[in-house]
């Protein structure tokens, strides 16, 4: 008996061939001996089977002695043995229809679990192997689970169902809902305008939800909500914003926040959360603000940074075009009795400058100038 595997929702063509290359009498029936279809001369007639409106043949092939049974929009319950009777022979084809579906939705939040469920006909014992877009293989029986979805899991999952040495391939598009970056750091000189951007790693036609930015300033004992907003069909509207600082928010995606000026009291880290409509859980992006200030008070030139800096970052003070006078893995450095000239305060990571602030030291009889 020939075995044919089909996919739920697809179309399958079961073949039946006569030795005579001409249109002769044929008919297809199921294992319950119910007629599906047959011919009456050059015309096709359908039986009273459940397949009625989904069964078809190709009249153009009858003259060549081919009498296929085409079943459209396959269902699991179409799994059966189909019998073609032509001339004095019977051709039996066992059709096994499988379906593979993702749990509830194919749009999942980062960190959530993906469960793929295989629908299979009774009596079958298929094995399933799925390959994620990043090349990870998972195997299983009726269900396959992947916990802690990552951004790289977005894309087409290819799953192969194996039964009776035959295979059928399913492709499922999974969208992991996440921000493009889990975390970002913005380095700014005191007084500069700060731009925070929160680009999403996915695109959907309609995006609705609500969000909030909580901020933990380095100098503050507790975090506070800086802004809350709504998102409706990709349009952003601010619900509530603090007076200090008074953030501004872009009306379109990507989510964009502007802090009028960087001040030491704002340095710290924030957590932007976005709750999407019809989704349990929230998207998160961490954002960090590092603020630098260079000052000269009497005979002391000081450079300070506030905010979440890594211990390996180097803070330096140097006179322009000269070697660093002071360089430390600390958040404040100073030079006593600095020479006149343009001084540079540099925050660097392995030689790469992250933040730079210049301060002009005048001869001792005049006051310092900060450009």
């Amino acid at each position: 008996k020939k075995v044919v595997l089909g996919k739920k929702g697809d179309t399958v063509e079961l073949t039946c061939t006569a030795s005579q290359k001409k249109s002769i009498q044929f008919h297809w029936k199921n294992s319950n001996q119910i007629k599906i279809l047959g011919n009456q001369g050059s015309f096709l007639t359908k039986g009273p089977s459940k397949l009625n409106d989904r069964a078809d043949s190709r009249r153009s092939l009858w003259d060549q002695g081919n009498f296929p049974l085409i079943i459209k929009n396959l269902k699991i319950e179409d799994s059966d043995t189909y019998i073609c009777e032509v001339e004095d022979q019977k051709e039996e084809v066992q059709l096994l229809v499988f379906g593979l579906t993702a749990n509830s939705d194919t749009h999942l939040l980062q960190g959530q679990s993906l469960t793929l469920t295989l629908e299979s006909p009774p009596g079958s014992s298929p094995s399933v192997q799925c390959r994620s877009p990043r090349g990870k293989n998972i195997q299983g029986g009726k269900t396959l689970s992947v916990s802690q979805l990552e951004l790289q899991d977005s894309g087409t999952w290819t799953c192969t169902v194996l039964q009776n040495q035959k295979k059928v391939e399913f492709k499922i598009d999974i969208v992991v809902l996440a921000f493009q970056k889990a975390s970002s750091i913005v380095y700014k000189k005191e007084g500069e305008q700060v731009e925070f951007s929160f680009p999403l790693a996915f695109t959907v036609e309609k995006l609705t939800g609500s969000g909030e930015l909580w901020w933990q300033a380095e100098r503050a004992s507790s975090s506070k909500s800086w802004i809350t907003f709504d998102l409706k069909n990709k349009e952003v509207s601010v619900k509530r914003v603090t007076q200090d600082p008074k953030l501004q928010m872009g009306k379109k995606l990507p989510l964009h926040l502007t802090l009028p000026q960087a001040l030491p009291q704002y340095a710290g880290s924030g957590n932007l959360t976005l709750a999407l409509e019809a989704k349990t859980g929230k998207l998160h992006q961490e954002v960090n603000l590092v603020v630098m200030r260079a000052t000269q008070l009497q005979k002391n030139l000081t450079c300070e940074v506030w905010g979440p800096t890594s211990p390996k970052l180097m803070l330096s003070l140097k006179l322009e075009n000269k070697e660093a006078k002071v360089s430390k893995r600390e958040k404040a450095v100073w030079v006593l009795n600095p020479e006149a000239g343009m001084w540079q305060c540099l925050l660097s990571d392995s030689g790469q400058v992250l933040l730079e602030s210049n301060i002009k030291v005048l001869p001792t009889w005049s006051t310092p100038v900060q450009p």
């Epitope: 009498q25 007629k35 009456q40 007639t45 004095d88």
Partner: antibody
């Protein structure tokens, strides 16, 4: 020429069975389906079922399942219909018919009259 | 099952005139460009005789005064000009799907 010759009239008692025949000639018997239909006096036509003489596969109208049994004998080019547990409702003329090259029943037997009476 | 409704149940037509019989199906009997509707003539004591198959095809040996038309669910049998021998009962029948079903019949009387 194509001919379908049916057996003669039957007078049967309620509860009994009857088996009628339809002998085909003028064509290859296994190449065409034999259909069976009935017509009660002064009434319309009803399709009972069909038999594929080559394989012996028979298909029935739901209304006649359990009432009619269709068989065919390739050696004698004859199709048969047996009706069981007869009641007065089964009194009718029973036809065998074959399709032509088109969609309709082009060839008919003359019919077998079955009368069910005590 | 597909139900066929014929109208009128009976009609009387003068010799040489046109007789028109209608048949309405409960669902479409079309498939792949063909209409699976047939027309028969039956005289008392005789089996039905196939006149038209697949809505408009004249069966061999049937006079050209018989013609059929229609598609989907609405079909018509026309006889023109009507002759004396056309007095009979006419049936439509669908063969789109099993079970094949027949209309209730139209009795044609010649005036």
């Amino acid at each position: 020429q194509v001919q379908l010759q049916q057996s003669g009239p039957e007078l049967v008692k309620p509860g009994a069975s009857v088996k009628m025949s339809c002998k085909a000639s003028g064509y290859t018997f296994t190449d065409y389906v034999i259909n069976w239909l009935n017509q009660r006096t002064g009434q319309g036509l009803e399709w009972i079922g069909e038999i594929y003489p080559g394989s012996g596969s028979a298909y029935y109208n739901e209304m006649f399942k359990g009432k009619a049994t269709l068989t065919a004998d390739k050696s004698s080019n004859t199709a048969y219909m047996q009706l069981s547990s007869l009641t007065s409702e089964d009194s009718a003329v029973y036809f065998c018919a074959r399709r032509g090259t088109g969609t309709g029943f082009a060839y008919w037997g003359r019919g077998t009259l079955v009368t069910v009476s005590a | 099952d597909i139900v066929l409704t014929q109208s009128p149940a009976s009609l009387a037509v003068s010799l040489g005139q046109r007789a028109t019989i209608s048949c309405k199906a409960s669902q479409s009997v079309d498939y792949d460009g063909d209409s699976y509707m047939n027309w028969y003539q039956q005289k008392p004591g005789q089996p039905p005789k196939l006149l038209i198959y697949a809505a408009s095809n004249l069966e061999s040996g049937i006079p050209a005064r018989f013609s059929g038309s229609g598609s989907g669910t609405d079909f018509t049998l026309n006889i023109h000009p009507v002759e004396e021998e056309d007095a009979a009962t006419y049936y439509c029948q669908q063969s789109s799907e099993d079970p094949p079903t027949f209309g209730g019949g139209t009795k044609l009387e010649i005036k």
